[in-house]
């Protein structure tokens, strides 16, 4: 995590910050969708367990062509140890659930925020 | 509008149990944390511990550690604590209480924002 | 634990005058995260407790400007601007900090 934020900010930025920062896109998006997120897209659900910063990734990886979401998928991207590519299935996928993109973004922030709350960066 | 409606008042007899519940409504309990807190009769206010019901995660205070068991029901937007081992200390009047989470706040108060009425809980032989 | 001590234990104030609660915690209550939960609570007679001040100096709504919070590290102050007779009650510093939470022991407002 010591090399997040080379978009936002020159140097290393500390593990509480990138994720600060993450809380504040995904609260960018939802505050700011008047139109149906991503255009109604549907992407897989996950658990919100460890490894998630992958699993959200991967989910999200898969769809394309929406602006709205390409700087969390950037910032996500910090989080996970492996390169995520479109197409990739992880364990931690809720199978046979697909959720909009809205919804996914509302209860992965709602996680993120307890997370922040309780000290676990990483 | 948000309310926290608790169980009514127990009388129980030393080293039993009691189960207070605490039905919430007004807003999801999976966006929040869910707080116990009690105050004995003249006292001081006490947090006793903490559940998050999104997944069941708890954070108890050490004294308590082993005697409250602190559970939460989605489906029926409940909070519960339950207290065994009962002693005449342990008569106190016990409050639920939520910290709330929302989509549009980066870094939401967390604070005790809402509490319950209270439980009046005497153990007496 | 951390222990939050409050001064005085009791406070009479006359309506109109100003009042000042002090409180102050065995170590330092800034979370990993940067912030620090500190927040106040007002107890009325016979009332559930109910939330004024959290992270030290932000207003919950509705609460009037004349209560403010203040402080930083160990060291921290509730302050009403003009005492009103419907301030009566115990107040009580919490802090969210570090596990085990806890509450000061609270200082009682009453009126002279």
């Known amino acids: 995590l010591t090399c997040l934020g080379g978009f936002a900010s020159p140097g290393p930025v500390p593990p509480s910050t990138a994720l600060r920062e993450l809380i504040e896109e995904l609260v960018n998006i939802t505050q700011n969708q008047k139109a149906p997120l991503c255009n109604g897209s549907m992407v897989w659900s996950i658990n919100l367990t460890a490894g998630m910063y992958c699993a959200a990734l991967e989910s999200l990886i898969n769809v394309s062509g929406c602006s709205a979401i390409e700087k969390t998928q950037r910032m996500l991207s910090g989080f996970c140890p492996h390169k995520v590519s479109a197409g990739q299935f992880s364990s931690l996928h809720v199978r046979d659930t697909k959720i909009e993109v809205a919804q996914f973004v509302k209860d992965l922030l709602l996680h993120l925020k307890k997370l922040f709350r309780e000290g676990q960066f990483n | 509008q948000v309310q926290l409606v608790q169980s009514g008042a127990e009388v129980k007899k030393p080293g039993s149990s009691v189960k207070v519940s605490c039905k919430a409504s007004?807003?999801?309990?999976?966006?929040?944390?869910m707080h116990w807190v009690r105050q004995a009769p003249g006292q001081g206010l006490e947090w006793m511990g903490t559940i998050d019901p999104a997944n069941g995660n708890t954070k108890y205070v050490p004294k308590f550690q082993g005697r409250v068991t602190i559970t939460a029901d989605e489906s029926t937007s409940t909070a519960y604590m339950e207290l065994s081992s009962l002693r005449s200390e342990d008569t106190a009047v016990y409050y639920c209480a939520r910290s709330i989470y929302d989509d549009y706040h980066y870094d939401d108060y967390y604070a005790m924002d809402y509490w319950g009425q209270g439980t009046l809980v005497t153990v007496s032989s | 634990d951390i222990v939050m001590t409050q001064s005085p234990l009791s406070l009479p104030v006359t309506p109109g005058e100003p009042a000042s609660i002090s409180c102050r915690s065995s170590q330092n209550i800034v979370h990993i995260n940067g912030n620090t939960y500190l927040e106040w609570y007002l107890q009325k007679p016979g009332q559930s407790p109910r939330l004024l001040i959290y992270k030290i100096s932000d207003r919950f709504s509705g609460v009037p400007d004349r209560f403010s919070g203040s402080g930083s590290g160990t060291d921290f102050t509730l302050k009403i601007s003009r005492v009103e007779a419907d301030d009566v009650g115990i107040y009580y510093c919490f802090q969210g900090s570090h596990v085990p939470w806890t509450f000061g022991q609270g200082t009682k407002l009453e009126i002279k």
């Open positions: 007004g807003f999801y309990i999976k966006d929040t944390y």
